[in-house]
């Protein structure tokens, strides 16, 4: 079970920093993030160490109320906290493993 | 009503430290991203530092970074700028400021604090 | 880091004047750009946000438009109180967030 955890966090910090360049990942962490509400790994601000995001962006299915565009200059209260990693770990535990 | 009021500025020797602070009233606090702004005598605009709501995330400007310190208290909804090593050129007016963010731009200004740093 | 540039730097102009001032950024900002007015000795003072929205309290003479890289402000009919320094200012990408160098406008 650990070892699974540990290989989902570690996949999906590696498609996090393909986010901008890949479509198809782009929209499968923005269906995750929409559907756990949670956003990024660990939270939020792993979104900041992406080199080819903006440091005031994050995707905008993390935002609480999706809209276009309202993952830029981003306000916390506006966006989920929860990290997916953590969110969607507890679902698989439940679930799944 | 909504109000900033800053207060700790003052005439300090180059190399010197000075404590900023920022006293907020008429609204939640912590719902705001804060900034220091500051402005030069006869210049510009020039941004310092902002954190963010919790104070997890602060980020500053080249000229200031490993300088300057921005912290928050929301508690007691107020807004600090810790200046260490101060250089003539960080002479300015300084202005607490709120940001609501997305594309609401910066509301709310306090009515500024002079620096001066000379010998 | 983006740039913004504002034009003209200074602008002399009478009571009653249509009066426009643009702003630049050196790379697509979409409609992430703010104005400010500033009296002397006095703090900035919010008047348009996102582009083209006018803030609370701010006379309808004041009217934003642009998006992308070219922005303008206009003033429809230049009142005393209207004589100021102007700043644009983006959000879409910081940090740094970054102001123009100002636009001073003076009595004719």
């Known amino acids: 079970r650990d070892k699974v955890m540990s290989e989902f966090n570690n996949n999906f910090r590696q498609q996090m920093e393909n986010y901008p360049k890949n479509n198809h990942t782009a929209s499968i962490l923005d269906r995750m993030q929409a559907d756990f509400k949670c956003c990024g790994a660990a939270n939020y601000t792993d979104w900041e160490k992406i080199p080819s995001m903006s440091k005031n962006r994050v995707p905008d299915s993390c935002c609480i109320n999706v809209t276009v565009g309202c993952g830029i200059n981003f306000n916390e209260k506006a966006i989920h906290k929860e990290g997916c990693v953590e969110k969607i770990g507890g679902w698989l535990r439940k679930n799944v493993l | 009503q909504v109000q900033l009021v800053e207060s700790g500025g003052g005439l300090v020797k180059p190399r010197g430290s000075l404590r900023l602070s920022c006293a907020a009233s008429?609204?939640?606090?912590?719902?705001?991203?804060m900034n220091w702004i500051r402005q030069a005598p006869g210049k510009g605009l020039e941004w310092v530092s902002y954190i963010s709501n919790s104070g997890n995330t602060k980020y500053y400007a080249d000229s200031v970074k490993g300088r300057f310190t921005i912290s928050r208290d929301n508690a007691y909804n107020s807004l600090y700028l810790q200046m260490n090593s101060l250089r003539a050129e960080d002479t300015a007016v300084y202005y607490c400021?709120?940001?609501?963010?997305?594309?609401?731009?910066?509301?709310?200004w306090g009515q500024g604090t002079t620096v001066t740093v000379s010998s | 880091d983006i740039q913004m540039t504002q034009s003209p730097s200074s602008l002399s102009a009478s009571v009653g004047d249509r009066v426009t001032i643009t702003c630049r950024a050196s790379q697509s900002i979409s409609s992430y750009l703010n104005w400010y007015q500033q009296k002397p000795g006095k703090a900035p003072k919010l008047l348009i946000y996102a582009a083209s929205s006018l803030q609370s309290g701010v006379p309808s003479r004041f009217s934003g438009s642009g998006s992308g890289t070219d922005f303008t402000l206009t003033i429809s009919s230049l009142q005393p109180e209207d004589f100021a320094t102007y700043y644009c200012?983006?959000?879409?990408?910081?940090?740094?967030?970054?102001f123009g160098q100002g636009t001073r406008l003076e009595i004719k």
């Open positions: 400021v709120r940001d609501p963010r997305s594309y609401y731009g910066m509301d709310v």
């Open positions: 008429g609204f939640i606090f912590d719902d705001y991203f």
């Open positions: 200012q983006q959000s879409y990408s910081t940090p740094p967030i970054t």
